[in-house]
Each structure stands twice: as C-alpha cells, then as structure tokens.
C-alpha cells in the first residue's frame, strides 16, 4: 500500500476505561498531530478509518461495527463503546486518508476492573483543596459528551467505600461535591457514579479522583532559611571536610517552583575551581509545605576556601531570600602544661600531660560552633 504518515504509538495517551461502562475516545490525530479539525478533514473528502490490535497480538484487524446493540460505533472523530468489555484492551489506530493523503496514529486502550470500593489500576487525577479556606468544589471529571444537556443524570458521590451522606463538611450537589471547609481528614479518593438513560438503556460512568488538602495561600510566606543562621559558625582547619547545610522551608503554593542554590563568592559552585559537591533532600508536611536541604560539601578544605563567602539562596513565588554561612579558619588552641606545686605533686612534679582548656570544652570549639 502507498505511504502513510505514521505517528507511531502515542503512549502519552494511555487511555484507561472501566469495564462495562461507556467510553468515548477521540482520535488523537486532530488533538495533537494535525493542524486541522475533523470537520475540515471531512469537508475535504478525507475518511477516518479505525482498526485495532488486540492485547498480546501483532495482527491489525478492523473494528467490528456490526455488534449487537451497536456496542462499538464511530461518530465523527469519536470511537464509542456502549459499553466496554475487558477484551477490548489493545492498541487502536485511527487513519485519515483519501487517494492522495494518509496520516495515522495508534494509542493504547486499557479496560480495567474496579473493586467494591472503586479501587483499580486507573491512574487518578489529583485535586488540591486549600486547608480551612472556605467553600471549595470538585467536579465529576470527564463526563462531557456522554449525554446531551437535555438528559438529567443522577450522580452519587462516595468517599472510599462510603456513600457521602450526613458528612459534616462535604455536600453532594449534582456534578459537584462541595467542601464547606477542608481539613486533612478530607484527604482521600472520591468517586462519582453518573447514571443516565440512552436509547432505552441505562448506563453508568464511574469517575474517581484523589483529594489532597494543602496549605492555604492565606498562610503562605516567603521561603524561610533555617540554616545557615547566625548561631552556627563553621570553624575548620585546612584539610578537614567542610559541610554546610542549607535548610529552607517553603509554604505550599499552587504551581510554584521552589528553588534552593548556593553561591560561593557570588558565583555558582560549578564556576569555582574547587571540588564542591551538593546533595539535596526534600521532605513534605501533610499539607505539602516543603523543606529542602542542600548540603554543600568540600572534602579537603583549604585556607583559601575558608576565606570565601558561602551564601544560600531560596526562591518561590512568594519571594527570594539569602543567608550567608559564617565560615572561619580554626585557630589552634594553645597547649597548656601546668606544673603542679604546693606539695600536691612532690613526687610527680610536672607530668607534662596537656590539660583541656575548661573555657573551650573538651573538643576545643565553642558550644555553638559547628564542625
């Protein structure tokens, strides 16, 4: 057959649908690959052809559009299942062509089963609600196009296994679920079951999403650098390892990029001719506030390195902050030899052993100094 622009398998569109429920799948050509829509293509005399490859098979085969009750049908650029079966799983291809033009793309469709509490291998969208923020809503997702606006479906909402009724702060309102005030206890999976009639049959759509309660913008602050701080001095002798942690707290901010970085003498560490490594760790609170720690490490510090300026910087959508670490070269402590006199050491008279300086403590550092 003649050449066809083959966009391959579009794995970005890993479509998952529930068994025994309707599914409408738009041909991805018009959404992601071509610059014109289906109507334009149809007007130009192009035909949309569908075929598929079953799971664990290599053979492409036509889709059977003559099944009882039109279980699978095509409408414009949409492939309809009313409803799906488990063995509809496979790779589906839509091809747009006429005698002079051809373009096609494949995509995987997975029909999945759910358990009695709506758990399944389905990847769930996450909806973030601000903690103690006032009324917020989630909407039953991906139900557009399944029934006309003249049809009034029934919608039943669940949290986990349980139908939502008599919840203090969560109220079902048709396609929406309203949270009068969101708390950490509202974290979880929420499912809407939409029931609608069509051509003398009743269909159900099940949609689950994860609600995550996060920090409120009302409480958001610019980044806070906990370390380095004014209480810790990094005193080192040349040849020792210098470790300076930069620990920064970031309030949760929707779509904010949190950044932490070090500068040495005003330059990025990569631009300085010294052997520096930086290790980062990130932790999150229950409301997704973030703590980032970047540890700057110089294995064998030189006296030159100990004269440099080490500054930790942090930035979020709320602002930018910086804090310099106090780094010093350690001055070796004088070693005292005390002659014991006055009869105490008549026989031992001057053992010559060094005695630790009681002012400096056993390890010759100030209490708040850091090694």
């Amino acid at each position: 057959s003649e050449r066809c622009d083959d966009w391959g398998l579009d794995t970005m569109r890993q479509i998952q649908v529930f068994e025994d429920e309707p599914a409408r799948i738009k041909c991805p050509l018009f959404e992601h690959f071509l610059k014109f829509n289906y109507s334009t293509a149809h007007s130009a005399g192009l035909t949309l052809i569908w075929y598929w490859t079953r799971q664990d098979r290599d053979l492409e085969e036509p889709i059977n559009f003559r099944l009882p009750e039109n279980r699978i049908s095509k409408e414009k650029d949409v492939l309809w299942f009313r409803p799906t079966l488990l063995n509809d799983t496979g790779n589906y291809t839509c091809m747009l062509r006429n005698t002079t033009y051809c373009s096609k793309v494949a995509f995987p469709l997975e029909v999945v089963q759910k358990d009695s509490c709506f758990n399944s291998p389905m990847k769930l969208p996450v909806h973030k609600l601000y903690i103690e923020y006032g009324i917020q809503r989630i909407t039953c997702p991906n139900v557009d196009g399944y029934f006309p606006s003249s049809v009034k479906p029934t919608i039943t909402w669940y949290m986990g296994c349980y139908k939502i009724q008599n919840f203090n702060n969560v109220i079902p309102e048709g396609m929406n679920l309203s949270f009068l005030i969101a708390f950490i206890s509202n974290n979880g999976n929420y499912t809407c079951v939409v029931t609608y009639p069509e051509n003398g049959r009743t269909f159900h759509l099940t949609r689950t999403l994860t609600v995550k309660v996060v920090g409120s913008p009302k409480n958001a602050v610019p980044p806070v650098i906990h370390s380095p701080n004014d209480h810790v001095v990094y005193e080192k002798e040349p040849g020792e390892e210098l470790l300076i942690p930069c620990t920064v707290y970031f309030s949760f901010l929707m779509d904010s990029r949190n950044e932490v970085w070090w500068t040495i003498d005003g330059k990025k560490p990569d631009d300085i001719p010294i052997d520096v490594t930086i290790n980062e760790s990130i932790s999150h609170s229950r409301t997704e506030d973030e703590t980032r720690t970047q540890i700057l490490s110089i294995k064998k510090v030189t006296s030159e390195d100990l004269k440099r300026s080490y500054v930790c910087h942090a930035r979020s959508a709320k602002g930018e902050v910086a804090k310099a670490a106090t780094v010093k070269q350690k001055v070796p402590a004088p070693r005292y030899t005390v002659e014991l006199a006055c009869g105490f050491g008549a026989t031992g008279g001057g053992s010559g052993k060094p005695i630790p300086n009681p002012l400096l403590g056993l390890d010759s550092t100030h209490h708040h100094h850091h090694h």
Partner: antibody
Framework: QVQLQQSGPELVKSGASVRISCKAS????????MNWVKQRPGKGLEWIGR????????NYNGKFKDKATLTADKSSSTAFMQLSSLTSEDSAVYFC???????????WGQGTTLTVSS | NIVMTQTPKFLPVAAEDRVIITCKAS??????VAWYQQKPGQSPKLLMY???NRYTGVPDRFTGSGSGTDFTFTISSVQVEDLAVYFC?????????FGAGTKLELK
C-alpha cells in the same frame, strides 16, 4: 440482554441447609453487586445482603447474618446463597438482584421457591 | 433500620383512573427511594429510582416525587396491564428496606 437465571425450587427438611444459585449473563458479573431478597406471602420484601463478585466483599442485613452466607464464582458468573439451620420461617421465594453500587435493583432473577418441611 | 410505611395496602381502580401511592420513611432518606412493580408469579421490575427518575423503558404515565421522608408514586391513567403490587424501597442506607406493598385491583 442482562439475565439472572436462578436454580429451581427446593424442598428441604427443617434443620438442614440449602444453596441457591444465580447465574448472570449479559454484563460484567465481577463489576456489579449481587443482592439477595426474601419474599414471604403477606410479609413483603426483605433484603438479605449483597456480594461484590470482583473481590468477594459482602454486606449483610444484621437480621440474616447468621442465616445466610453469600459467595460468588467469577469463572462461571454465578452467585450463591447458602441458608443454614432451616425452619418454616425460611420458607419463601428468594430473588437475586443486581445493583451497580447504587443500592437499587435494576435486574432481578425469576425467583427460587424454598419450602422447609418438618 | 429505616421503616418504609406504604399506603394504602389495597387500591381498587378502574381503567384510566389516576392513582397515588405514598411512602413515608421513618427518617430522612434524601431523595433515595425506588419504586418497583410486581405482577403475580413474576419478579419485581424497577420503575423509578432517586424518587423521580424513570427507569429506561418505563412509560411516562408513571411518575415519582418527594424527598426527606415523604414520597409519592403516581400513575396518571391506569391501564389494565398496570394491575400489580407496587413496592417502595429506600436505597439511602444499609440495611435496605421496602414498603409492605400496594395491590392495585379492579373495582
């Protein structure tokens, strides 16, 4: 196209047990709840409990907790209800009925008549 | 358990009569009430769910209404084939419970 086919009538002795079956076809058996309902003349309808064949999860009406045991076999798309320690009070028509998570019953079996004799 | 009190028990009707059956829940069940029709020797058939939603294939002479504790099922113009027993059921919470039934019989 959805069909629930129940086993035939049963005549059993008091104190014995019985197992009634309900074979489903025309839909994904694993993905809907199967309920059991008791009907005695002049006593209306009583919900016994339900099972989700996909994972075997069950909910029972407390009144029937020690009387009925619900099971399901996914490979044959069949739900079962075992009734134990039978008495004349258990003489009734038993229906299986499907629900899609929503607690109302869109398809019913034809019913199985159980007669308990002393 | 939620008790569903259905009235009347018996309802004598003539063809094309308007029929009203009521069901009262012992506590608030929102709008979660279903109605079934059962003919002699047959299994029940779903007519309405969520109080006012007609199940597919059910003629539009059947309507339902109500919320909270009081529910009404109406047949606007009774046909001979409507002679049957009608049950209400709350599908609000477990255990699911039914009304005692209303038998439509010819006058």
């Amino acid at each position: 196209q959805v069909q629930l086919q129940q086993s035939g009538p049963e005549l059993v002795k008091s104190g014995a047990s019985v197992r009634i079956s309900c074979k489903a076809s025309g839909y994904a058996f694993s993905g809907s709840w199967m309920n059991w309902v008791k009907q005695r003349p002049g006593k209306g309808l009583e919900w016994i409990g339900r099972i989700y064949p996909g994972d075997g999860n069950t909910n029972y009406n407390g009144k029937f907790k020690d009387k009925a045991t619900l099971t399901a076999d996914k490979s044959s798309s069949t739900a079962f209800m075992q009734l134990s320690s039978l008495t004349s009070e258990d003489s009734a028509v038993y229906f299986c009925a499907r629900d899609y998570y929503l607690f109302y019953f869109d398809y019913w079996g034809q019913g199985t008549t159980l007669t308990v004799s002393s | 358990n939620i008790v569903m009190t259905q009235t009347p028990k018996f309802l004598p009707v003539a063809a094309e009569d308007r029929v009203i059956i009521t069901c009262k829940a012992s506590q608030d069940v929102s709008n979660e009430v279903a109605w079934y029709q059962q003919k002699p020797g047959q299994s029940p058939k779903l007519l309405m769910y969520y109080a006012s939603n007609r199940y597919t294939g059910v003629p539009d002479r059947f309507t339902g209404s109500g919320s909270g504790t009081d529910f009404t099922f109406t047949i606007s113009s009774v046909q001979v084939e409507d002679l049957a027993v009608y049950f209400c059921q709350q599908h609000y919470s477990s255990p699911l419970t039914f009304g005692a039934g209303t038998k439509l019989e010819l006058k």
